[in-house]
């Protein structure tokens, strides 16, 4: 059965937008005016995983690209990457765990927890123009709260 998806953009709680930085990396920075067109549009798919009232498992693909955010171990550390997939097979309802994030809604803000690595979250730095990464702490210097903006298909 086809997987349900929606198109959206994400901004961190400091209102930084996410843009491509090279072919396989995202960075976060403040955008204004026409520069807003640079921000990446995600195709957020609703997939297999732990589901409750405030937690929904999703996969985050880049719209019209065969790239998905995924979580893997690099040098023994959970790491966020953009992974290329076969567009004939993705998205699917039952995605591999490394592609799955628990979208957690708390006080109108969203967190994205890795299903592969519990308590690791999609994060941005306080500093401008830095890579989006997988962070193992909440409530510290790094930012783990996001807002989502719907984009028409």
């Amino acid at each position: 059965a086809p997987v349900r998806s929606l198109n959206c953009t994400l901004r961190d709680s400091q209102q930084k937008s996410l843009v491509m930085s090279g072919p396989y990396e995202l960075k976060a920075l403040h955008l204004q005016g026409q520069d807003m067109e640079q921000q990446v549009v995600f195709s957020m798919s609703f997939v297999q995983g732990e589901e409750s009232n405030d937690k929904i498992p999703v996969a985050l693909g880049l719209k019209e690209k065969n790239l998905y955010l995924s979580c893997v171990l690099k040098d023994d550390k959970p790491t966020l990457q953009l992974e290329s997939v076969d567009p004939k097979n993705y998205p699917k309802k039952k995605m591999e765990k490394r592609f799955v994030f628990n979208k957690i809604e708390i006080n109108n803000k969203l967190e994205f927890e890795s299903a592969q690595f519990p308590n690791w979250y999609i994060s941005t730095s306080q500093a401008e123009n830095m890579p989006v990464f997988l962070g193992g702490t909440k409530g510290g210097q790094d930012i783990t709260d996001f807002t989502m903006q719907f984009v028409s298909s």
């Epitope: 059965a1 086809p2 732990e50 589901e51 409750s52 039952k94």
Partner: antibody, heavy 119, light 106 residues
């Protein structure tokens, strides 16, 4: 409390078509996937296929050419059809619900229907 | 077709810990589920999403999944835990059960 009640012919001849129906009582019908699983006597479980409320299906590749799963949302029922049966299709057939709260796996099962294929 | 391999049988003394394994290619990158089936009954879900317990399932049941192996662990095994246990996962667009393990409580 969710209940799945299934019925259908229990004795078939080779080459006939197996038909089973499962009725769902309690809970929403549209929020779940609905599956069929079978278990030959003394053997393990085999997943047959699934359907959602819109009629979208996935099937086990080994059975795909003979299987049809359909849904009747007005009655909260779904059905299994397996054509050209042989003795190898003798099994207990179960219907089950796949729920988002359990990670889209089978959390409620019917009581099972023994289907015997014999000439 | 994808294969999930389980030992046909596992024996354990009452009060001891039973471990039932399920092996499959890159199984740790998928979600694993476990069912208990007693003779003449429908299967019952005991572990979902690798390590979560449905309500009503005792705490002695736990699960893990990494690499190529998922494991169901029953600590303080009781006589009533004697049953067949099946692992379950997905392969692309379809679902696969392991061959089943008969747990005997000696």
């Amino acid at each position: 409390q969710v209940q799945l009640q299934q019925w259908g012919a229990g004795l078939l001849k080779p080459s006939e078509t197996l038909s089973l129906t499962c009725a769902v009582y309690g809970g929403s019908f549209s929020d779940y996937y609905w599956s069929w699983i079978r278990q030959p006597p003394g053997k393990g479980l085999e997943w047959i296929g699934e359907i959602d409320h819109s009629g979208s299906t996935n099937y086990n590749p080994s059975l795909k050419s003979r299987v049809t799963i359909s849904v009747d949302t007005s009655r909260n029922q779904f059905s299994l059809s397996l054509s050209s049966v042989t003795a190898a299709d003798t099994a207990v057939y179960y219907c089950a619900r796949a729920s988002p709260s359990s990670g889209w796996t089978l959390d409620y099962w019917g009581q099972g229907t023994l289907v015997t294929v014999s000439s | 077709q994808s294969v999930l391999t389980q030992p046909p049988s596992v024996s354990v003394s009452p009060g001891q810990t039973a471990s039932i394994t399920c092996s499959g290619d890159k199984l740790g990158d998928k979600f694993a589920f476990w069912y208990q089936q007693k003779p003449g009954q429908s299967p019952v879900l005991v572990i979902y999403l690798d390590n979560k317990r449905p309500s009503g399932i005792p705490e002695r049941f736990s699960g893990s999944n990494s690499g190529n192996t998922a494991t169901l662990t029953i600590s303080g095994t009781q006589a009533l835990d004697e049953a067949d246990y099946y692992c379950y996962a997905w392969a692309d667009t379809y679902e696969v059960f392991g061959g089943g393990t008969k747990l005997t409580v000696l």
